[in-house]
Each structure stands twice: as structure tokens, then as C-alpha cells.
């Protein structure tokens, strides 16, 4: 059973079969004798009741208003009324793109990760019994698939799979041939699964400083969007008015991960800032990674091996 048309605003392409199904349908079957009315209003036109004589293209059923096919002048507001129940739809019929097998404004976009399962199934449950055949096109070129009733693609995605896939259903009604097109814009992206976040550079950094001067300690990491990067220092963070955490900067990598950096600024360096650990940590659901900075007076730098020294 096809679900009812609950969305209040609908856009459709001219020249295709289309239907509106009201949302009290089960109720309508229980009350066969109840008067059911469909109305249309557009522009200055007040609510005009629709009937089979309104247009040869319009068919009225208990639950459904059908268009064979829908045309540009069908744009407007449609109402269904039965007993205590009233429903309204605003229908916008747009021009078909005559230079393509699909109309850009009627495309559903989907993002698929490379190597992940990718599926396109051409189905149309409402018109199923009337469909003669269905074709699947990629970028308007017909794909040769075994099943011409419900063509399907099922595979692990590759970058070459990116493109516009159009399911075109061909059906007959009252001796006329119609088609219904449903198009998907498939974008293939890099694997977006989480990485283990990592801090860049050595785990322990000795920084040569001069008393009374300022220093900026830069902590950089490669991480996931939801991961956090923070500084820990002293017994109570924030107890030293000369220490400031700057705003975190983030740049997205081409792979969809994040490069983050957070600077700890120490102003007017004093003795109390020397030889203590300033720890930078990146934390995620998968665990943490920490690197440490130690400020060392320049005069004492001869005592430190060169390979652990940063400026």
C-alpha cells in the first residue's frame, strides 16, 4: 500500500503521470457512502470542485487524484474534503528539460563512501501494475542490465560510479505511453570512518626561553570532527594570569578529516614557568594522545641534547 502524500509542497515535472493521495484513506474505505470532494484553486480562481469532466487528464478515485499526465497549468493548490477531514497540497509543475533525460530540479542527491555498499533499485510501487518496462541510465546513457522490470545496481562503490542515475519507467494508460523519471546524483567520497587522532611532532619538547619574554607553544593534531584538543598545565588551569589558551583553528583535509592547532601563549615568562610540564592532549572516543612542552632557560640549553630541542 503506497503511503499518502503528506508533504504540503510538491514539485513535479510536466508530462509525467502524477498522483495525490490523501491521508485519511483507510477511513474513506470504511465510509463508502460519505461524500468526498476534490478542489483546486490557483491565482484569482476560488476553490473549484474537480470532477471527471474537469479534464480528460484527471482521474478521481476514493483516495487518489491522478493526473495523466500533469501539465504546467495544473500548478496550484489542491484540497481534499470528506466529512470532518480536510487536506491541502501546493503543487508546482516545472518545465521538463528537453535537452537531457532528467530535469535538474528533480534530482535526489546521495553521498556514498568509496568501497562501501552502493545500491540503486528502480521501483515505483504506485504504478507497478501499469509499468511495461523500466530502464536505468547513467549520465543519460542506457545501462544494459538483465532485469528490465526492476533494474538494480548492487556493488561496492568506486570513484568511477559517480554520476547521475535515472530510472525511467514506461507505462501504458488508456492506450497512451507515458514515462516517469526518478534521478539520483551519486557522489563518491573518501572513506569517512574515524581515524585514531594523532598529535604532530615529538612527544617531548624542550623550548629555550628568556625570562620576561613571551612564548607561543603550538600544538597540532590530525583528528575527527567530534574530537577535542586541550591544554593542561599547573595544579589549577587558569591560576596563572600570564598563560592564555588561544582559539582553536581547524582546517578540513581533502580526506574529510581535520587538522587542528591550539596555541598556548605564555607572557612575561617567570621562574615559575620553567621546568614544568605543559601538556597538550587530543581526546576521542578511541582514546587520547598527549605531548609535553618544558620551558628551559636559554643559558641552560647546553645541558639538553639537540634532538629534543624546539624553538
Amino acid at each position: 500500500a503506497e503511503s499518502c502524500t503528506s508533504r504540503p509542497h510538491i514539485t513535479v515535472v510536466e508530462g509525467e503521470p502524477f498522483y495525490l493521495k490523501h491521508c485519511s484513506c483507510s477511513l474513506a474505505h470504511e465510509i463508502e457512502t460519505t461524500t468526498k470532494s476534490w478542489y483546486k484553486s490557483s491565482g484569482s480562481q476560488e476553490h473549484v470542485e474537480l470532477n471527471p469532466r474537469s479534464s480528460s487528464r484527471i482521474a478521481l478515485h476514493d483516495c487518489v487524484l491522478e493526473f495523466w499526465p500533469v501539465e504546467l497549468n495544473d500548478t496550484g493548490s489542491y484540497f481534499f474534503q470528506m466529512k470532518n477531514y480536510t487536506q491541502k497540497w501546493k503543487l508546482n509543475v516545472i518545465r521538463r528539460n528537453k535537452h537531457s533525460c532528467f530535469t535538474e530540479r528533480q534530482v535526489t542527491s546521495k553521498i556514498v563512501e568509496v568501497k562501501k555498499f552502493f545500491q540503486i533499485t528502480c521501483e515505483n510501487s504506485y504504478y507497478q501494475t501499469l509499468v511495461n518496462s523500466t530502464s536505468l541510465y547513467k549520465n543519460c546513457k542506457k545501462l544494459l542490465l538483465e532485469n528490465n522490470k526492476n533494474p538494480t545496481i548492487k556493488k561496492n562503490a568506486e570513484f568511477e560510479d559517480q554520476g547521475y542515475y535515472s530510472c525511467v519507467h514506461f507505462l501504458h494508460h488508456n492506450g497512451k505511453l507515458f514515462n516517469i523519471t526518478k534521478t539520483f546524483n551519486i557522489t563518491i567520497v573518501e572513506d569517512r570512518s574515524n581515524i585514531v587522532p594523532v598529535l604532530l611532532g615529538p612527544k617531548l619538547n624542550h623550548v629555550a626561553v628568556e625570562l620576561g619574554k613571551n612564548v607561543r607553544l603550538n600544538c597540532s593534531a590530525l583528528l575527527n570532527e567530534e574530537d577535542v584538543i586541550y591544554w593542561m598545565f599547573g595544579e589549577e588551569n587558569g591560576s596563572d594570569p600570564n598563560i592564555h589558551e588561544e582559539k582553536e583553528m581547524r582546517i578540513m583535509t581533502p580526506e574529510g578529516k581535520w587538522h587542528a592547532s591550539k596555541v598556548l601563549r605564555i607572557e612575561n615568562i617567570g621562574e615559575s614557568n620553567l621546568n614544568v610540564l605543559y601538556n597538550c592532549t587530543v581526546a576521542s572516543t578511541g582514546g587520547t594522545d598527549t605531548k609535553s612542552f618544558i620551558l628551559v632557560r636559554k643559558a641552560d640549553m647546553a645541558d639538553i641534547p639537540g634532538h629534543v630541542f624546539t624553538r
Epitope: P8, F79, T86
Partner: nanobody, 122 residues
Framework: EVQLVESGGGLVQPGGSLRLSCAAS????????MGWFRQAPGKEREGVAS???????YYADSVKGRFTISRDNSKNTLYLQMNSLRAEDTAVYYC????????????????WGQGTLVTVSS
């Protein structure tokens, strides 16, 4: 932008009358139905009256015969005429508009106003 703006609330004595207005933008006004709802302190919001396409009207049992819902299409405005007011009518009154309506139940994409306070007290 869809907007519903109520006005006309205030303090009134028991037995008195008030007329609430709801000015609506086009999309909200030309809907399947519009209605008045109310919420008394500590209670759930309840339907008071609704008017459907072709001016079909529905009322809560507690207001039948006392309240009248109407609209003026030239002004895109919904009204609620409240007569013989009682203390139990005290509430914030909301105007609403929906694309799916079943008597007083709004079941679809529903727009709400900010509400206007009606106090019935001596």
C-alpha cells in the same frame, strides 16, 4: 515568511465578551483549516474551534453556543467571538493553521501564533 499574529486578548468579567483576531500571511491563511486553541496554566493545549475549507466549522463541546469562529478573506484574518465568558475560559489563546485537519485536530504541517492572554475574572 509565514506568520500568524493574534490580538484582542485582555481582562474581562464573567459573562462578558471578547473578540480575538488572527492576522495571517497568505500561505498560512489559504490552508486546509485554521483554528483557535487554548492553554490554561498547568494544563495541556486544547482545541477550541476550527474552520475548514468552504467554511465548515467545528467547536469543542465546552464552547458550543458561546463562541463563534469566522474569517474575512479580504483581510486574511481569522476571528473568534467569545460570549458569556467563564472563569474556566482563562488561558492563552493561540491561532493555528495546518495542511491536514480532522475536525479540531491539526495533523499536518502546522503553523502557530505566539498567543494572546484572555483572563476572565471579577
Amino acid at each position: 515568511e509565514v506568520q500568524l499574529v493574534e490580538s484582542g486578548g485582555g481582562l474581562v468579567q464573567p459573562g462578558g465578551s471578547l473578540r480575538l483576531s488572527c492576522a495571517a500571511s497568505g500561505t498560512a491563511y489559504d490552508n486546509a483549516c485554521m483554528g483557535w486553541f487554548r492553554q490554561a496554566p498547568g494544563k495541556e493545549r486544547e482545541g477550541v474551534a476550527s474552520i475548514h475549507l468552504r467554511d465548515r466549522t467545528y467547536y469543542a463541546d465546552s464552547v458550543k453556543g458561546r463562541f463563534t469562529i469566522s474569517r474575512d478573506n479580504s483581510k486574511n484574518t481569522l476571528y473568534l467571538q467569545m460570549n458569556s465568558l467563564r472563569a474556566e475560559d482563562t488561558a492563552v489563546y493561540y491561532c493555528a493553521s495546518s495542511n491536514i485537519c480532522n475536525a479540531l485536530n491539526l495533523q499536518g504541517n502546522t503553523y502557530w501564533g505566539q498567543g494572546t492572554l484572555v483572563t476572565v475574572s471579577s
